[in-house]
């Protein structure tokens, strides 16, 4: 055998007698004419040797130690090589040791390629004989992080100030790679972080540093668990001891990314959390121990990852294959923060990819399932775009704005279904015709239905909200000049039962200049409340809206404004209102920035109310609320 170590490798090879066996014949290392029982080879040296016996593996072991100094220069990060190559070494039980020394402020991360590592306790051994012993240091004190075998879940171990990794390979093992790499990280501000990755169901047993001896005083150790969101994790403590604390309290803390209750603090004697969905961290925090009688803190625990118990495996099909330009998002509804531990709530695609948010797009059929203790924690938001690019093709074309039944059958509440209606600029306008006449939501007459339609401009630069409308009113149709979004927003779970009341048809019609026209056909004995768009923010500058109010032949309409003055102050232009009888074309014009609003007026025939805004000064906006009431003509109106 020849071993030549590169001079800057900082490697020392030691061949020495292993545990003595009851073999009659001794064995020696032979160099030239000398017979020796221990050989040390340092960087830059070259030694040629043989053994005096046929089976040196029964007598000798080899240790290869590489010192990695990250204190005086850059650290050689990346994949760690087995150096010298195992093929150049005698076939002895071999231990490769990497001793990395770094500054206290530098984090070092050992990354283990697949197969990952499985921690073993005292007295246990690895089936294939390959063991990884990992230790760190606190000042001059060596801290054992643990001993590990292959085929486990531990993928990364982060430490700071230094790390010693020993890989023991039996003489017959063919392994020729270290199986890990070293990376630098920012300070982890704790003893170590162990990352454990679960690909599927399984369990991992893990131990505190120095186990079964005591965990270092007042230290913090963290385990990060990466768990597929469709599985559930439960933690159980197999064995623990508490030390005698003088200050602070020994505890474990759970951190669940995305949770509003972080960190969850538990005593070691508490029942530990179960049924956690997705990733979580567990930290062990020591205390300041009593100097006279410290006792020991130690912990051995198990994480069990399995498919959820007592939960429906029902799969829902969402068929969006015939839809275009549509996306459906299932997401957590906003909740008030609570300090209580809350299990995860997930939606899964094909039962494999689970997350707290899921967006489905049109053109495909999707299979979804839920992993959630309470589905009311989720809601759905849907967006669909209906656009017309060629005005010759779209004119007079109609589309039904209806929530597809597949979506209604999902066990999650629909929050918003938004249709974005896009038309070619200055070529076409839109008309919305509801299946049931609509009521405009006002403070005076609020909607109390399970859903409403929110109509707003979809032109990015334009801040124009036409209002919120619900079934059961007098608005027969709404015409809008240009792009709008119509959002069906639900307010109660009873929407499922009332879904039949929804239904809105949009048609592309010839272009008109007004921002919006509301066609109102009031019912007898009901008071219709109407208000200008952008209520509370004021009708946008230079915007014009109209109401076409129908009055049946045997009825009289009373038009009432709810304030004496409009309150608008114009910076430029004039704000005015025109009330025009449709039959006679007779009209009254009111200057809204000067005149008082008209007293209640009576109209025997259908009439128009048109309101046009000026450019108001800020804070003096145009907001008008008015009502229309029908009464039979026979009634004496004086």
């Amino acid at each position: 055998f020849e071993i030549a170590l590169p001079r800057e490798s900082n490697i020392t090879v030691l061949i020495k007698l292993g545990t003595p066996t009851l073999l009659a014949k001794p064995c020696y290392i032979v160099i030239s004419k000398r017979h020796i029982t221990m050989l040390s080879i340092k960087s830059g040296e070259r030694i040629v040797f043989t053994f005096s016996c046929q089976s040196p593996e029964n007598h000798f072991v080899i240790e290869i130690q590489k010192n990695i100094d990250c204190m005086s220069g850059p650290c050689p990060f990346g994949e760690v090589q087995l150096q010298p190559s195992t093929s150049l070494l005698p076939t002895l039980n071999r231990t490769f040791i990497w001793d990395v020394k770094a500054h206290k402020s530098i984090g070092l991360e050992l990354q283990f390629s697949i197969p990952r590592l499985r921690q073993i306790g005292p007295g246990e051994s690895c089936p294939d004989g390959v063991t990884h012993s990992i230790s760190g240091r606190i000042d001059a004190t060596v801290v054992r992080i643990g001993t590990f075998c292959s085929n486990g879940t531990v993928s990364r171990i982060k430490m700071q100030e230094g790390v010693k990794m020993a890989l023991h390979l039996p003489w017959f093992h063919p392994r020729n790679v270290s199986g890990f790499s070293i990376a630098n990280r920012s300070s982890i501000k704790r003893l170590c972080i162990i990352e454990s990755v679960f690909e599927g169901e399984g369990s991992a047993t893990l131990m505190s540093a120095n186990y079964p001896e005591g965990f270092p005083e007042d230290e913090l150790m963290t385990w990060q668990f990466v768990v597929p969101a469709h599985l559930r994790a439960s933690v159980s403590f197999l064995n623990f001891n508490l030390s005698n604390c003088e200050r602070k309290e020994e505890r474990v803390e759970y951190y669940i990314p995305g949770s509003t209750t972080n960190p969850e603090v538990f005593k070691l004697e508490d029942k530990q959390p179960g049924n956690m969905a997705g990733n979580f961290n567990l930290s062990l925090q020591g205390c300041d121990q009593d100097a006279q009688s410290p006792g020991i803190l130690r912990l051995q625990f198990q994480v069990l990852v399995q498919h959820p118990q007592n939960e429906s495996n029902k799969i829902y099909v969402v068929d969006l294959s015939n839809e275009r330009a549509m996306s459906l998002t299932i997401e957590p509804r906003p909740v008030k923060q609570s300090r209580k531990f809350v299990p995860g709530c997930f939606v899964c695609l094909e039962s494999r990819t689970c997350s707290s948010n899921l967006t489905l797009t049109s053109g495909s059929k999707h299979k979804i399932s839920f992993l959630c203790d309470d589905l009311t924690r989720l809601w759905m938001n849907v967006e669909k775009t209906i656009s017309c690019t060629d005005h010759r093709y779209c004119q007079r074309k109609s589309y039904s704005l209806q929530v597809p039944s597949d979506i209604l059958h999902l066990p999650v509440e629909l929050h918003d279904f938004s249709w974005k209606l896009l038309v070619p600029k200055d070529r076409l306008s839109l008309v919305l015709v509801p299946a049931q006449k609509l009521q405009q939501h006002t403070h005076e007459k609020p909607c109390n239905t399970s859903f409403s339609y929110l109509v707003a401009s979809a032109i990015p630069s334009q801040d124009l909200y036409f209002g919120s409308f619900c079934p059961g009113g007098s608005i027969k149709q709404i015409q809008v000049k240009q792009n709008i979004s119509v959002t069906l927003r639900t307010f109660a779970p009873s929407f499922q039962q009332e879904a039949s009341r929804q239904g809105l048809t949009v048609s592309f019609i010839p272009y008109f200049k007004e921002e919006g026209v509301f066609t109102v056909t009031p019912d007898t004995k009901s008071k219709v409340y109407l208000r200008t768009p952008n209520w509370d923010r004021g009708l946008p500058s230079l915007t014009s809206v109209s109401w076409n109010i129908s009055v049946p032949r045997d009825q009289v309409a009373c038009l009432t404004f709810f304030k004496e003055r409009s309150g608008v102050v114009c910076q430029t232009g004039r704000a005015f209102m025109i009330i025009q009888e449709q039959r006679t074309r007779a009209e009254e014009i009111f200057s809204l920035d000067e005149d008082v609003l008209p007293k209640p007026s009576f109209h025997h025939h259908s009439f128009w109310v048109n309101i046009s805004n000026c450019s108001p000064t800020s804070g003096k906006q145009l907001d008008l609320l008015f009502s229309v009431t029908l009464t039979p003509r026979t009634v004496d109106l004086t």
Epitope: A4, R7, I31, S32, R34, I47, V48
Partner: antibody, heavy 120, light 112 residues
């Protein structure tokens, strides 16, 4: 009989390059570490570089690192030293030397040397 | 790097008389194997160096037995029991323990 014969020396200007060769015979070349050692006129011996049997490991004296490259062709029983960015202080007789098979870095055979003169 | 220091730098000797050259290393050349990795070379005028002694005291093949090497750790000696005229040249010690391999400055042996 073991023989090492160097060639390729000559006069070269500072900053120039030169490639030295060493032809080996009389032994199994691929089993031995090989070295280049130099001797400046009237001065002592200075080890320059070495190369492992299969060429997988190489080492150099600090003063030539990054400028000189040692290589070998076991099929042709040849050792090479590619020298670039030559300086006046590289002027020397360059010897190729074989490392003994036993432990350590002992040189049991040397070539006759080839003179490299770096001068403008 | 290990520094090798030889003395004397020049050694005039009468043929038939013994000669001794000393070599000191800045670090011990005694290996865990029990060997001292120190070699001695002779470079005759106009020739390339030839190995005399390796591993501190082992004579290379073909080297007359009037040459012997001794010492351990950091102090070594090359002895010529009876100098002959053909022994003229420069003697170098070399540490063969680790790279970079280093030589002593050389001791010039000349006939009185």
């Amino acid at each position: 009989e073991v023989q090492l014969v160097e060639s390729g020396g000559g006069l070269v200007q500072p900053g120039g390059s030169l490639r030295l060769s060493c032809a080996a015979s009389g032994f199994t070349f691929s089993r031995y570490w090989m070295n280049w050692v130099r001797q400046a006129p009237g001065k002592g011996l200075e080890w320059v570089a070495n190369i492992k049997q299969d060429g997988s490991e190489k080492d150099y004296v600090d003063s030539v690192k990054g400028r000189f490259t040692i290589s070998r062709d076991n099929a042709k029983n040849s050792l090479f030293l590619q020298m670039s960015s030559l300086r006046a202080e590289d002027t020397a007789v360059y010897y190729c030397a074989r490392v003994m098979y036993s432990s350590g870095w002992s040189f049991d055979y040397w070539g006759q040397g080839t003179l490299v003169t770096v001068s403008s | 790097d290990i520094v090798m220091t030889q003395s004397p730098l020049s050694l005039p000797v009468t043929p038939g008389e013994p000669a001794s050259i000393s070599c000191r290393s800045s670090r011990s050349l005694l290996h865990s194997s029990g060997y001292n990795f120190l070699d001695w070379f002779l470079q005759k005028p106009g020739q390339s160096p030839q190995l005399l002694i390796f591993l501190g005291s082992d004579r290379a093949s073909g080297v007359p037995d009037r040459f012997s090497g001794s010492g351990s750790g950091t102090d070594f000696t090359l002895k010529i029991s009876r100098v002959e005229t053909e022994d003229v040249g420069v003697y170098y010690c070399m540490q063969a323990l680790q790279t970079p391999i280093t030589f002593g400055q050389g001791t010039r042996l000349e006939i009185k």
